[in-house]
Each structure stands twice: as C-alpha cells, then as structure tokens.
C-alpha cells in the first residue's frame, strides 16, 4: 500500500507560529511501541503455495539498518502434489515503509525520512484470462 | 519482518562530540524518494487464492495519516473451482513499519518515531499434518 505525499503540511507549524528555522524540526529520541513484534509464523515463506526467499540489505546510516526484501521463488504456484502450477501466478506483495537516513559532517548530525519499497511476501493469484486474435 | 531495537545508538552523536541537548535531534524537512510508488498488481487482494479486505485507519497526528490494514477474508484458500478449501489456510503477512507521531503544545511542535505492525496481505499455506491420539 502506498504512503500519500506529505505536501510537507504535516511537518509545518500552525500558520500563526514562527516558521521552523533552517528547514528542520525537532525529533524526540526513542521509539514509541519499540517492543512491538511481528507475530508471523516461522517458515510461512516455505509453506506458502507462493513461496519466497529473503534478501537482507544492510546500511549503517539507515534506521532500521537491516531491510529485508522477499523474492517469489516461482512463476506459478505450488499445488497439492507439490508441483508448480503455471496456470496460477506467484506475485509479490509490496508495502511502502519509512526509514530514517542519518547524515553527518563531523559533529553535525541530522536525520531525514526516506520512503522505501519493501516486498513483504508473495501470494498466489488466478490470472484473468483474455483470448486474443493472432494476426 | 521485524525492526531491530535501536538501542538508541543510531541517534547518538559520536562519543567525541557534545551530547544532543534535551534528548532531541534535528529532522530535516522533506522525504527522500517521496515519489516512489508501489507497483503491485491491481486487485491482487481479490484475485488471490487467499483474498483479503482492507481497513483504513486515519490519524491526523501521524505520518502517514492513513494506515491500511489487511484482513484475510477466508479461513481456507480458494481452489480452482472457486470454492473454499479448508485443507489449506489463508494466513496474514505482517510487516513492522515506522510512522512519525506529531506532538504539539501551542507553537512548540516535536516529532517522534513510532513502530506500527501492518498486515499487508495474505498468503495460502499448506499446514504440516500431525496425527495425535484423542483421550
């Protein structure tokens, strides 16, 4: 799902207030609900009829430093016999997420939000069938 | 997938630098890659063998204000005949994501990161079968 554009109004002070100096804002240290955890089953990526693998990207100047991307293993889906069925398609499920980018020059450290597109997993879809005429 | 704990080291200045005053940091206005967009297939949530619905939550003091949560429509998965097959399970795919929380008292506005658990969609899984003794 997509994150709408900010239009930067979210980060503006009310009109009656003096503007933010130097185009920056105050970000409080600490993360709300930091201990919240995904309750997704282990091995869901292997048991799915549209299985996927994970690739980890690492960037020490990004929070979170580790971003995990899924890649669908198959073109089709796995049927009850464990065989790939090409009449169905394994398709990626994507999500826009925010990360924080750290920028520093000496002791001057600032942060900026960055939008990242994450493929979270895959799902099996029945394609819509169209019959076209050969020419 | 889960976001690791910060341990708050990410937001600290190098040890040789003076500490951040008042437990806050400088967040630059603007979002990197703001125009990046999800390229997910249209109607994937209806075409999936583990279809889902979306619920939108709205909070004007959160960025993004709109957070979309998926709920699996079925317990089982939809087979080639369009019937629900309870020998399989429709299971949610979850992702931890960051949002920004806005806090204001008059003209004093600050922001804080918040971790949110989002169900992005559903996938169909084949459960591992175990035979147990009834008592």
């Amino acid at each position: 799902r997509k994150i709408p554009k900010v239009g930067h109004t979210f980060f503006q002070k009310p009109e009656s207030c003096p503007p933010v100096p130097g185009g920056s804002m105050k970000l409080d240290i600490g993360i709300i609900n930091e201990n919240q955890r995904v309750s997704m089953s282990r091995n869901i990526e292997s048991r799915s009829t549209s299985p996927w693998n994970y690739t980890v990207t690492w960037d020490p100047n990004r929070y979170p430093s580790e971003v995990v991307q899924a890649q669908c293993r198959n073109l089709g889906c796995i049927n009850a016999q464990g065989k790939e069925d090409i009449s169905m398609n394994s398709v990626p499920i994507q999500q826009e997420t925010l990360v924080v980018r750290r920028k520093h020059q000496g002791c001057s450290v600032s942060f900026q939000l960055e939008k990242v597109l994450v493929t979270v997993g895959c799902t099996c879809v029945t394609p819509v069938i169209h019959h076209v005429q050969h020419h | 997938r889960k976001i690791p704990k910060v341990g708050h080291t990410f937001f600290q200045k190098p040890e040789s630098c003076p500490p951040v005053p008042g437990g806050s940091m400088k967040l630059d206005i603007g979002i990197i890659n703001e125009n990046q967009r999800v390229s997910m297939s249209r109607n994937i949530e209806s075409r999936s063998t583990s279809p889902w619905n979306y619920t939108v939550t709205w909070d004007p003091n959160r960025y993004p204000s709109e957070v979309v949560q998926a709920q699996c429509r079925n317990l089982g998965c939809i087979n080639a005949q369009g019937k629900e097959d309870i020998s399989m399970n429709s299971v949610p795919i979850q992702q931890e994501t960051l949002v920004v929380r806005r806090k204001h008292q008059g003209c004093s506005v600050s922001f804080q990161l918040e971790k949110v658990l989002v169900t992005v969609g559903c996938t169909c899984v084949t459960p591992v079968i175990h035979h147990v003794q009834h008592h």
Epitope: M40, S41, R47 | L75, N89, V91, V125, P127, H131
Partner: nanobody, 118 residues
C-alpha cells in the same frame, strides 16, 4: 505435542440434537483455528465447521449451515459443535482438528462416531 481431548458423539434419532466438544492441550502453542471434518462410509473426508481464533469468525459447509453451530471457549482452548435437526446423511466419523502456529501445523485426532438412525 498438542493433545486433543474429545467428548460427545453416539446414537441420535433423526431430527435430534448432539453436542461434540474438543479441547487442545499440551505445551505452549498459539491456536489459529479449530474445527471438524467428517467421513461417511465410502465417502471422502469433508469439512463440517471451523472457527478462526484471532477474531472468532465461524465457517460452515453448505450441507450443515443453519443446523450446526460452532462456538469456542478461549480459556480452555476448546470448541463445541452443536448439531440440531440431524439427518441420516449426517452419520459419519467426526474428526476434530486444531491448526496452530499461525496455521502452519494441523493436528488431527482420532474420530468419534455419530450415528443418526431411528
């Protein structure tokens, strides 16, 4: 290892009622769903009813809709199947199952005989 403790079953007259119960126990597990399938003589095992643990949503086979009701007891990790207006075609061995660990593991127990006959 998940254990399934069942109760109910037996002989009932057409038009009568019966209540089957099944409780999951043993170790630490998170329930995804519980329910019943049934197997009539010479027929394949078919789905009867189930309940999803996360939200309590119930699911029924068309053949039992309006006659059977599935309910759960969260505290006991148990499900109950109330069967009303029973017909001879409901005669079967009923199998309780429990899906755990996010639906990735399914535990089947031994069946319980339900006979609808006058």
């Amino acid at each position: 290892e998940v254990q399934l403790v069942k109760s109910g079953g037996g002989l009932v007259q057409p038009g009568g009622s019966l209540r089957l119960s099944c409780a999951a126990s043993g170790g630490t597990f998170s329930l995804f769903a519980m329910g019943w399938f049934r197997e009539a003589p010479g027929k394949e095992r078919e789905f009867v009813a189930a309940i999803r643990w996360s939200d309590g949503s119930s699911y029924y086979a068309d053949s039992v809709k309006g006659r059977f009701t599935i309910s759960r007891d969260n505290a006991k990790n148990a499900v109950h199947l109330q069967s009303n207006s029973l017909k001879s075609e409901d005669t079967a061995v009923y199998y309780c199952y429990a899906d755990v660990q996010g639906g990735l593991h399914r535990y089947w127990g031994q069946g319980t005989q339900v006979t609808v006959s006058s």
